[in-house]
């Protein structure tokens, strides 16, 4: 028989949700208003196209992504629109308050609803950590905690490190990864006994989840050109990146292959190992001088992404009870990590050829930020698993974990799905 | 050649409102960003605002924020200053700047590296 | 001006000249100096940018440096012609904007 929402979840859902909109909407109508200066509509709707790129890659690529379980694909694809929609809101805020609002209103412009997007994104990249062992009232706190934490992340880093929108954004990257890492680890682990199949993927979810991959891997240049300043900056990002996810395709198909005692690809590993370039240049991606820098980036990306979703599932899924699948989190802390360090270098060339030691300087403060993304993500993700963990959410039972039928109607199944 | 004309200045009181244009030639107006800088008699710069390439991103000054507002139309290769509530203090050669760069391994630096020759504002009742 | 710098300064042609520029850790301390002349009657030129390059035109008298929050511009083989207003710049984190010097009036004697 069909499994329904507990009685108290179905009260307790609409009202938190609709009560959280109705506050975002009077605090829209009392602190924002549009930025009325927009003199050339050409340039408006080519700042919009980026802001769409991001959209369609959080919506569709995001979202169809995590979608590959055999039984909570639905789930998977709507929760992350839900999540979207409402961190977008609470991101332009919580933007506006801590950057703008001293001088007054928050001013909405096309830049502000990018930058939302992107902070929004930060929440998809975790929940893959826990989608499947949460209800959507969980979801809730979690993007609220989520974009809060990586909003002040960034003021503090924009403030203290002197970092641009670009560098500070580029943290999302990890902060995403070990703060959704985290949340995971505070969760009910165990599957209980019968219901092992349900976080397995199936072909048709497989699929959906390639469809996602393939948006993500044909948008991620415009996600790491998006808060660049300059024309060149954003022409070098858009090259750097789509050449290192090139080469990142053909080292996951390959590399898969070559991992795999008769030689077979996993679905799984090339899911996420396509993205690994994206993420491992995004950092310095406006930065890197030569194509071929860019594709070595994007070929040492892809083996870590395949040797990581080889080895490194049978580990979380025991510590963190995330399961095989769920493989971005751990995928995107690496990555993050690498091209966190790729900036390093680059910093440290800046010393040897300029023989200065201000840039000396910038390289602890480079090493500082990264410390200080890390620390912020597990604190926040251990407050938020801890907030996920009380029982005014009504968590679905662990029985219950990975199954559309808990959250969705489904008409035409009387029994099993 | 790169020129940049700016236009609109006078006299005008205190408390109303003012709009200053600088046309661009000579190189790819939406390939830069643009600065206002200004100068009051017998004093020094000071930095007014700041406007991204494409109209994305805006930055101004704490003693202006509020009052005035940059813009920019590409297509008419025109930068503009709307100045809100002016004040005496606003007394000033307004002068135009093209935004440039320079890479190092591991950033951009910006400077201005074109000027215009500035439009005189002066606010007095 | 967020950056201190002396009102003016004087030198005989063909002396060596400099003009200093004070500032703090959120402006010269962690961001690049610039330097702009000034002729009179004029719109200002960049002379020096990230703390000591020069652009193409700009004679190799002209030099920078830079030492914590302090920087100095060096003019060296003083001319008729260098006689005009000198500004330091520099971004300010803080303020999140830019910020000059007072200005430096350098009189060729």
């Known amino acids: 028989m069909s499994s329904k929402y507990p009685r108290s979840v179905r009260r307790c859902l609409p009202l938190w949700a609709l009560t959280l909109e109705a506050a975002l909407i009077l605090l829209f109508y009392f602190f924002t208003h549009y930025d009325a200066s927009l003199e050339d509509q050409k340039g408006l709707v080519a700042s919009y196209q980026v802001g769409q790129d991001l959209t369609v890659m959080a919506a569709i690529g995001l979202g169809f992504l995590t979608s590959s379980f055999r039984r909570h694909s639905w789930s998977s694809v709507a929760f992350n629109l839900f999540m979207l929609a409402l961190g977008v809101q609470w991101a332009i805020l919580l933007d506006g308050f801590l950057s703008q609002f001293p001088s007054g209103k928050v001013v909405i412009t096309l830049f502000s609803i990018r930058l939302a997007t992107m902070s929004a994104l930060s929440v998809l990249i975790s929940v893959d950590a826990v989608l499947g062992k949460v209800n959507l009232a969980q979801l809730v706190v979690m993007v609220l905690v989520e974009v809060t934490a990586l909003g002040n992340l960034r003021m503090v880093i924009s403030n203290i490190f002197n970092t641009d929108y670009h560098m500070n954004m580029m943290h999302i990257y990890v902060f995403a990864a070990y703060f959704g890492l985290s949340v995971a680890w505070c969760l009910p682990k165990p599957l209980p006994e019968g219901t092992e199949d349900k976080d397995q993927t199936a072909t048709i979810p497989s699929l959906s989840a390639m469809l996602g991959a393939l948006f993500l891997w044909m948008f991620w240049p415009s996600f790491n050109s998006a808060l660049l300043r300059s024309p060149i900056e954003r022409k070098n990002a858009v090259f750097n990146t789509y050449y290192a996810v090139a080469v990142s395709v053909v080292t996951a198909i390959s590399g898969s292959s070559l991992a795999h005692p008769q030689g077979k690809i996993s679905k799984t590993y090339v899911h996420s190992a396509v993205l690994a370039g994206g993420v491992a240049v995004g950092t310095s991606c406006h930065l890197i001088p030569s194509p071929w820098l860019a594709m070595v980036l994007g070929l040492v990306a892809g083996l870590i992404s395949v040797g990581g979703a080889k080895y490194l599932p049978g580990c979380c899924n025991r510590v963190l009870g995330i399961p095989h699948s769920s493989i971005m989190g751990y995928n995107f802390s690496l990555l993050g990590l690498l091209g966190e360090i790729i900036y390093i270098v680059l910093l440290v060339l800046d010393t040897v050829g300029a023989g200065n030691g201000m840039i000396g300087f910038q390289v602890l403060l480079s090493i500082g930020e990264l410390s200080l993304a890390i620390v912020i993500a597990l604190m926040s993700g251990l407050l938020t698993g801890l907030l996920l963990n009380l029982k005014i959410w009504k968590a679905p039972h662990e029985a219950k974990y990975f199954d559309d039928q808990v959250f969705w109607k489904f008409p035409h199944l009387a029994v099993g799905f | 050649e790169v020129q940049l004309l700016e236009s609109g200045g006078g006299v005008v009181q205190p408390g109303r409102s003012l709009r200053l244009s600088c046309v661009v030639s000579?190189?790819?107006?939406?390939?830069?960003?643009m600065h206002w800088v200004r100068q009051a008699p017998g004093k020094g710069l000071e930095w007014v605002a700041v406007?991204?390439?494409?109209?994305?991103?805006?930055y101004y000054a704490d003693s202006v924020k509020g009052r005035f507002t940059i813009s920019r139309d590409n297509s008419k290769n025109t930068l503009y200053l709307q100045m809100n509530s002016l004040r005496a203090e606003d007394t000033a050669v307004y002068y135009c700047?093209?935004?440039?760069?320079?890479?190092?391994?591991?950033?951009?630096?910006?400077?201005?590296?074109?000027w215009g020759q500035g439009t005189l504002v002066t606010v007095s009742s | 001006a967020e950056l201190t710098q002396p009102p003016s300064a004087s030198g005989t042609p063909g002396q060596r000249v400099t003009i200093s520029c004070s500032g703090s850790?959120?402006?010269?301390?962690?961001?690049?100096v610039y330097w702009y002349q000034q002729l009179p009657g004029t719109a200002p030129k960049l002379l020096i940018y990230?703390?000591?390059q020069r652009p193409s035109g700009v004679p190799d008298r002209f030099s920078a440096f830079k030492s914590g929050t302090s920087a100095s511009l060096a003019i060296t083989g003083l001319q008729a012609e260098d006689e005009a207003n000198y500004y330091c710049?520099?971004?300010?984190?803080?303020?999140?904007?830019?910020?000059f010097g007072g200005g430096t009036k350098l009189t060729v004697l």
């Open positions: 850790s959120s402006n010269i301390g962690s961001k690049y």
């Open positions: 000579g190189f790819t107006f939406n390939n830069y960003g």
């Open positions: 710049q520099s971004y300010d984190s803080g303020l999140s904007g830019w910020v």
């Open positions: 990230s703390n000591n």
């Open positions: 406007i991204w390439f494409d109209g994305s991103n805006k």
């Open positions: 700047a093209r935004e440039n760069q320079i890479k190092l391994w591991s950033r951009y630096l910006y400077y201005f590296d074109y």
